[in-house]
Amino acid sequence: QRFAQAQQQLPLESLGWDVAELQLNHTGPQQDPRLYWQGGPALGRSFLHGPELDKGQLRIHRDGIYMVHIQVTLAICSSTTASRHHPTTLAVGICSPASRSISLLRLSFHQGCTIASQRLTPLARGDTLCTNLTGTLLPSRNTDETFFGVQWVRP
Amino acid sequence: QRFAQAQQQLPLESLGWDVAELQLNHTGPQQDPRLYWQGGPALGRSFLHGPELDKGQLRIHRDGIYMVHIQVTLAICSSTTASRHHPTTLAVGICSPASRSISLLRLSFHQGCTIASQRLTPLARGDTLCTNLTGTLLPSRNTDETFFGVQWVRP
Amino acid sequence: QRFAQAQQQLPLESLGWDVAELQLNHTGPQQDPRLYWQGGPALGRSFLHGPELDKGQLRIHRDGIYMVHIQVTLAICSSTTASRHHPTTLAVGICSPASRSISLLRLSFHQGCTIASQRLTPLARGDTLCTNLTGTLLPSRNTDETFFGVQWVRP
């Protein structure tokens, strides 16, 4: 019985199914395009199991291949608004350490008000992911409209 | 040899990699915004391993963090017709038990004809997920255009 | 200690967490709507662990349920361009063996310049996945804008 229980725990502890789902906290000051995230059961349905937040940015704690996903909805938006303020672009990337800085995922809104995508990417312990929203439109803070998460997939 | 076999089964049975991918069965009567789903190998490439269908809605059988994903394409659509009924919105949420009712994922079509997104969320045994399509435009029943699924990720 | 290490390897070797993330190599000649993919650490952040490339198309090596995901961004694109060249459509499907040929995922660009989606689907060893982009617009080769991947989820 104890053996079976130990087995159940292995994937979480040894293999480290690190996972996080974050909700938008706030946008940065005008010259800072980064979105600032928050997570934790007290906030609703967001959580961090493994990764951590560092000043609103997500820091990876375990090497591996991760599924990174994001959805961002613009707050006050119609297809007309979205195209008037073109280009509004979202980019997810590794922003630190600087030596590993790279854009992982990039989408423009064009005439839409929501972008959503996902991708597999190798990440290393200490990598910090930043999500940059360029343009003059603000993202919705509704937790079912704007969210960002990672899921450890394999070493 | 027997030990290795037992190991292979553990994640499926003990850890319970519950997973489901559903295809659209039908829409509800006019006052019911819910989409009704179906799944099973006889229907094509849809399946349920763990979760169940309850009157076309997906019911969760195992507590855990799940990746929920959905794509819905409007049946007859151009960028002009997509905005014929504004707003046409898709929302995925827990609709029962009522005490846990919440919107998990929400997207509007604006001038687009397809929405697709995914997110990580904690779900509990007995949670029923509903997908509400508000508006007067019909979703395509083509299995490569409209689908809805969940994947258990970790406890 | 050796026991714990053996455990850690089991999911990768016995359960076979096959995974691949590919970047666009090139498009086909005019009459060939297929996108040709490439992957490997030398190319950047793309990789193949299990699946293989066969003339730029992804071939599956292990039976199971997979999460298939894709993002394609059109290279020179505005909402006007996208709608002028309508319909530009992306379809992901099993293209060989011919007996298993089927469309798994289909999206049109309409007035957008990026499509992104994902779905769960059963795949068998030997299945080759093709991604067909119909229309006259070219996909971006930027690795953060256009990518295609699969992740083994369960047997």
């Epitope: - | 014929r84 009924h85 504004h86 029943r141 | -």
Partner: antibody
């Protein structure tokens, strides 16, 4: 309850312009498109096109491109059909009809009779 | 454009009997799991009234004696049993693609 009330009958001379109104009540005007349908005396129904009440974008059937214009006064929940350079063959009853998306045209105005005669 | 041909152009049916009206499309109006065909009733001096949407669905408030069927290019409106108040002209209309078109109409007379 939902109602579409159209303006009264019009008698015009060839070459003149007419503007018909269709005032909607009982629902959110900008949530549903508005169709326009022509019916010549003793004849069948002809779909003229529709206007997107949210964006204001009109779509015209080929036979109604040029002299016909759909417009809106969103604040008054009103759609308009204007016909320029009237011809005898424009003599008809014109209906506005709410576009209930893929479910057809579910509410219709009572119709506006336009007579073009010299 | 999709041409809708209705038949017959007119018919007379005895009270309590069945009236059957046919509508044929020049190309399929079915796609993505639906048939985009609708039926309307128009009485003299009145606007049309939606009876059936998406080939077979009864609009709210419409009596159950009206029914629709068909897919692809061939559609049928049935009225059974016919009542006095059903004397009217009936039109089919598709919304498969722009431009939407109507059939030429079928005038139903009650004997």
């Amino acid at each position: 309850q939902i109602q579409l009330v159209q303006s009264g009958p019009e008698v015009k001379k060839p070459g003149e312009t007419v503007k018909i109104s269709c005032k909607a009540s009982g629902y959110t005007f900008t949530n549903y498109g508005m169709n326009w349908v022509k019916q010549a005396p003793g004849k069948g129904l002809k779909w003229m096109g529709w206007i997107n009440t949210y964006t204001g974008e009109p779509t015209y059937a080929d036979a109604f491109k040029g002299r016909f214009a759909f417009s809106l006064e969103t604040s008054a929940s009103t759609a308009y059909l204007q016909i320029n350079n009237l011809k005898n063959e424009d003599t008809a009853t014109y209906f506005c009809a709410r576009d209930y998306g893929d479910y057809g045209m579910d509410y219709w105005g009572q119709g506006t009779s336009v007579t073009v005669s010299s | 454009d999709i041409v809708l041909t209705q038949s017959p152009a007119s018919l007379a049916v005895s009270l309590g009997q069945r009236a059957t009206i046919s509508c044929r499309a020049s190309k399929s109006v079915s796609t993505s799991g639906y048939s985009f065909m609708h039926w309307y009733q128009q009485k003299p001096g009145q606007p049309p009234k939606l009876l059936i949407y998406l080939a077979s669905n009864l609009e709210s408030g419409v009596p159950a004696r009206f029914s629709g069927s068909g897919s692809g290019t061939d559609f049928t409106l049935n009225i059974h049993p016919v009542e006095e108040e059903d004397a009217a002209t009936y039109y089919c209309q598709h919304s498969r693609e722009v431009p939407w078109t109507f059939g030429g109409g079928t005038k139903l007379e009650i004997k």
